[in-house]
Interface confidence: medium
């Protein structure tokens, strides 16, 4: 028996489809081999010859089994407010994510297109909702009996200390000042310390999710900047 010949290309019968890692070539009317990730179709198949694949050149990639004539260009280098979490290789695009203290204001298929600094709540305001990788900090005025004396993207409003004798009453941006020697902390309801936002990476222990295997084919419209919330500092 002669040596086995390559199976592709072949004509699909009615009711059957090309197999995984094959595609139907409309010109040849044959099922032909796809090129593996990191490669592209250099020569398309014919009725008698299969697809000829070639490796992607530097700074280009293909992430999926494909029959594209040219590899996709890797995205531009990460900006100063970003970190490169995945390098550009022949099989994957560069992925840029926002560095600690920043969040993604405009995302793309993988990584971030535009980073913005996390809002800082000024004194008299505390963090109502911490920032995440994709959302900004939300500030709220400190309620009576609580205060925040910092300009911070992580600090919440804390309860005033309870004095036996008050020297200076507390307000939204300053703690009470006592004259006694043994002040006690009130436990105002809801006075729970919020965790730091994930985007600061200070407590980031979750693994980064697997990148999507879908190619970047959609373009997002740029978004206008959102007005700062009351109590945030202008940067």
């Amino acid at each position: 028996l002669p040596a086995q010949v390559a199976f592709t290309p072949y004509a699909p019968e009615p009711g059957s489809t090309c197999r995984l890692r094959e595609y139907y070539d409309q010109t040849a009317q044959m099922c032909c081999s796809k090129c593996s990730p990191g490669q592209h179709a250099k020569v398309f198949c014919t009725k008698t010859s299969d697809t000829v694949c070639d490796s992607c050149e530097d700074s280009t990639y293909t992430q999926l089994w494909n029959w594209v004539p040219e590899c996709l260009s890797c995205g531009s280098r990460c900006s100063s407010d970003q970190v490169e979490t995945q390098a550009c290789t022949r099989e994957q695009n560069r992925i840029c994510t926002c560095r600690p203290g920043w969040y993604c204001a405009l995302s793309k298929q993988e990584g971030c297109r535009l980073c913005a600094p996390l809002r800082k709540c000024r004194p008299g305001f505390g963090v109502a909702r911490p920032g995440t990788e994709t959302s900004d900090v939300v500030c709220k005025p400190c309620a009576p009996g609580t205060f925040s004396n910092t300009t911070s993207s992580t600090d919440i409003c804390r309860p005033h200390q309870i004095c036996n004798v008050v020297a200076i009453p507390g307000n939204a941006s300053m703690d009470a000042v006592c004259t006694s020697t043994s002040p006690t902390r009130s436990m105002a309801p809801g006075a729970v310390h919020l965790p730091q936002p994930v985007s600061t990476r200070s407590q980031h222990t979750q693994p980064t999710p697997e990148p999507s295997t879908a190619p970047s084919t959609s373009f997002l419209l740029p978004m206008g900047p959102s007005p700062p919330a009351e109590g945030s500092t202008g940067d």
């Epitope: 199976f7 004509a11 019968e13 009711g15 059957s16 489809t17 197999r19």
Partner: antibody, heavy 119, light 111 residues
């Protein structure tokens, strides 16, 4: 597991009609094209008719074109072969078979039902 | 007469290797359509042995192998066993007939 069970065969006079059924189970019926193949006593296999998974496309051998009609009821997972104007040469065991999704070929077959056309 | 041509019979002794040929034309094998092989044991329904020229469905021993080149195809059986005695059919799709075609069948006898 995949099962195909034919029924409806029997003795019929020339010029008569018969309807064969094939009950399918153990797979997603709508995802597969189905076919009928027959085998006359002591003879080889002969493809008779085929139908796409959605029932939109049908195919017939020249020997049965205009006399036989293939159809399917995907809600009942059943394949049919309506045979009209039967002739003595239609006498055979009729098999229903599932067409492989990829590459082609008939990957599962029923046990067959005998159709005898005789006066 | 069948569109695909097979020898009516072949034979071999246990342990031997036999091949069954199947000759097609430009409208089936020559058009790029695959060859499929079936085994039919006496009194049973056919069973898919090889599909798409060379592919063995799960459960089919690797003693069975298929080959296709141009308008010809063949089935090889190595290490012949008594239970291999059966009828073997080749099959393909024919674009000029717009339908599936079978070879006339080959009876394998294990001596």
């Amino acid at each position: 597991q995949v099962q195909l069970l034919e029924s409806g065969g029997g003795l019929v006079q020339p010029g008569g009609s018969l309807r064969l059924s094939c009950a399918a189970s153990g797979f997603s019926f709508t995802s597969y094209a189905m076919t009928w193949v027959r085998q006359a006593p002591g003879k080889g296999l002969e493809w008779v008719s085929g139908i796409s998974g959605d029932g939109a496309a049908t195919f017939y051998a020249d020997s049965v074109k205009g006399r036989f009609t293939i159809s399917r009821d995907n809600s009942k997972n059943t394949l049919y072969l309506q045979m009209n104007s039967l002739r003595a040469e239609d006498t055979a065991v009729y098999y229903c078979a599932r067409q492989s999704q990829y590459v082609g070929g008939f990957d599962y077959w029923g046990q067959g039902t005998l159709v005898t056309v005789s006066s | 007469q069948s569109v695909l041509t097979q020898p009516p019979s072949v034979s071999g002794a246990p342990g031997q290797r036999v091949t069954i040929s199947c000759t097609g034309s430009s409208s089936n094998f020559g058009a790029g359509y695959g060859v499929h092989w079936y085994q039919q044991l006496p009194g049973t329904a056919p069973k898919l042995l090889i599909h798409g020229n060379t592919n063995r469905p799960s459960g089919v021993p690797d003693r069975f192998s298929g080959f296709k080149s141009g308008t010809s195809a063949s089935l090889a059986i190595t290490g012949l066993q008594a239970e291999d005695e059966a009828d073997y059919y080749c099959q393909s799709y024919d674009s000029s007939l717009s339908g599936w075609v079978f070879g006339g069948g080959t009876k394998l006898t294990v001596l």
